[in-house]
């Protein structure tokens, strides 16, 4: 059994998340994840889910009762989602930490917009073989 | 030329984002995007970047001077990033709109954590061929 399971159960107790009423009104994440089979689509959704959990954990980082559980789970996310790749995790964290109300950040974001947009679709990537693979993947996932 | 280019130039004027000093202290997004060649890694990063732009646009949605530009750019993101798939965009929006401080949302998130974690790594998906492809891809992108 993965170590995160025991720690997630500990979090459940802390948040009273094992109560039957928690399942009322559908799921937050699970139904959405079931909708997307193609890996690139799943990453789009999981990226948002992981950033949600990181924000949640940040809000409770000073609570000693769950600190070990939170650290264990974060470590497991780093292994599973970021392939133990610190640079990937650091780049992700940078993106999640930008303040959308900071005028300097706003100006930079708008300055970079055209180039960001040009790279958004898989077909925009260079390399004919890669591009044709992408295109097949996109069609299959739609 | 894609229609978003003209509208992005309009946003640049509005935010004074064409000034030379905007490039000071590095980029927000472009250097990070250059780091990641593998499509699934790019989607992880682009997911955060797109949600940043959507939040930014939301903050300025009532400003008539840039409303048309914002709508055109959002439409182009929907085409390029979400493949014109409304369900994909709707699921993404749901995820970005969850409030991390809402106790009911917190409880649901913790309740779902074990299942979310179990699906985080590509290897968790069924299919030996798919899994081995993923692993090759993952190594190449680290």
């Amino acid at each position: 059994q993965d170590p995160y399971v025991k720690e997630a159960e500990n979090l459940k107790k802390y948040f009273n998340a094992g109560d039957p009423d928690v399942a009322d009104n559908g799921t937050l994440f699970l139904d959405i994840l079931r909708n997307w089979k193609e890996e690139s689509d799943r990453k789009i959704m999981q990226s948002q889910i992981v950033s949600f959990y990181f924000k949640l954990f940040k809000n409770f980082k000073d609570d000693q009762r769950i600190q070990k559980s939170v650290e264990t789970i974060k470590e497991d996310i780093n292994v599973k989602f970021f392939n133990s790749n610190k640079k990937k995790r650091d780049d992700f964290e940078k993106l999640t930490n930008y303040s959308v109300t900071d005028s300097n950040v706003q100006r930079k974001a708008v300055h970079e917009l055209i180039q960001v947009m040009a790279e958004l679709s898989p077909a925009a990537k260079i390399g004919k073989r890669k591009r044709s693979q992408m295109f097949r993947g996109r069609r299959a996932s739609q | 030329q894609d229609p978003y280019v003209k509208e992005a130039e309009n946003l640049k004027k509005y935010f004074n984002a064409g000034d030379p000093d905007v490039a000071d202290n590095g980029t927000l997004f472009l250097d990070i995007l250059r780091n990641w060649k593998e499509e699934s890694d790019r989607k992880i990063m682009q997911s955060q970047i797109v949600s940043f732009y959507f939040k930014l646009f939301k903050n300025f949605k009532d400003d008539q001077r840039i409303q048309k530009s914002v709508e055109t750019i959002k439409e182009d993101i929907n085409v390029k990033f979400f493949n014109s798939n409304k369900k994909k965009r709707d699921d993404f929006e749901k995820l970005t709109n969850y409030s991390v401080t809402d106790s009911n949302v917190q409880r649901k998130a913790v309740h779902e954590l074990i299942q979310v974690m179990a699906e985080l790594s590509p290897a968790a998906k069924i299919g030996k061929r798919k899994r081995s492809q993923m692993f090759r891809g993952r190594r190449a992108s680290q």
């Epitope: 079931r34 909708n35 089979k37 193609e38 689509d41 996932s141 | 014109s84 409304k86």
Partner: antibody, heavy 123, light 111 residues
Framework: EVQLLESGGGLVQPGGSLRLSCAAS????????MSWVRQAPGKGLEWVSA????????YYADSVKGRFTISRDNSKNTLYLQMNSLRAEDTAVYYC????????????????WGQGTLVTVSS | NFMLTQPHSVSESPGKTVTISCTRS????????VQWYQQRPGSSPTTVIY?????PSGVPDRFSGSIDSSSNSASLTISGLKTEDEADYYC??????????FGGGTKLTVL
């Protein structure tokens, strides 16, 4: 109340042309993607063509590509379908339909539908 | 392109429940919204379910829509059948490549 009223159908010989119109009222026409859907006699529904709210993007079924042209005049709240090189298999009731979801630039579903106009291609 | 396959016809008695299936031939049924239209004889189609499971105002809650990823199909369920429900029913989805697909239609007979 949203209303869509098609016109322009009729009998035409193979190889001939027709122009269908759809007059829209009861909603902000330019905010919605619009479509044409057809139904051959006794058969099912077949999507034919779609156009974004601005008119900047158009989409066609493979069966009509290169022969049919969709357009719209937002100042007149009217949708058009120019049909050229008509074939016997184009015989159908043609429905004009509004996108059910506001502000999405390609239609995802169709609501409401007009009453339809019959196009008969026969010699 | 995928196809949406529906049974040609179904029949059931008034007051009973009937389910009409719509199976997607390739790609995931869950990855695009599914709609259901009712077409009574001599009339234009009207929406009874949109975006998988949403009911337009005016459509009774006897109509419900669902998605089943394991069978890669969508379903329209009508409970408490009435004679006025007798009609053709079509499922529809967007294929992601700027094409809109309809199922072949199912004729519902209320016995």
């Amino acid at each position: 109340e949203v209303q869509l009223l098609e016109s322009g159908g009729g009998l035409v010989q193979p190889g001939g042309s027709l122009r269908l119109s759809c007059a829209a009222s009861g909603f902000t026409f330019s905010s919605y993607a619009m479509s044409w859907v057809r139904q051959a006699p006794g058969k099912g529904l077949e999507w034919v063509s779609a156009i974004s709210g601005s008119g900047g993007s158009t989409y066609y079924a493979d069966s009509v590509k290169g022969r049919f042209t969709i357009s719209r005049d937002n100042s007149k709240n009217t949708l058009y379908l120019q049909m050229n090189s008509l074939r016997a298999e184009d015989t159908a009731v043609y429905y004009c339909a509004k996108d059910g979801s506001s502000g999405w630039y390609v239609p995802h579903w169709f609501d409401p539908w007009g009453q339809g106009t019959l196009v008969t291609v026969s010699s | 392109n995928f196809m949406l396959t529906q049974p040609h016809s179904v029949s059931e008695s008034p007051g009973k429940t009937v389910t009409i299936s719509c199976t997607r031939s390739s790609g995931s049924i869950a990855s695009n919204y599914v709609q259901w239209y009712q077409q009574r004889p001599g009339s234009s189609p009207t929406t009874v379910i949109y975006e998988d499971n949403q009911r337009p105002s005016g459509v009774p809650d006897r109509f419900s829509g669902s998605i089943d990823s394991s069978s890669n199909s969508a379903s329209l369920t009508i409970s408490g059948l009435k004679t006025e429900d007798e009609a053709d029913y079509y499922c529809q989805s967007y294929d992601g490549s700027n094409r809109w697909m309809f199922g072949g239609g199912t004729k519902l007979t209320v016995l």
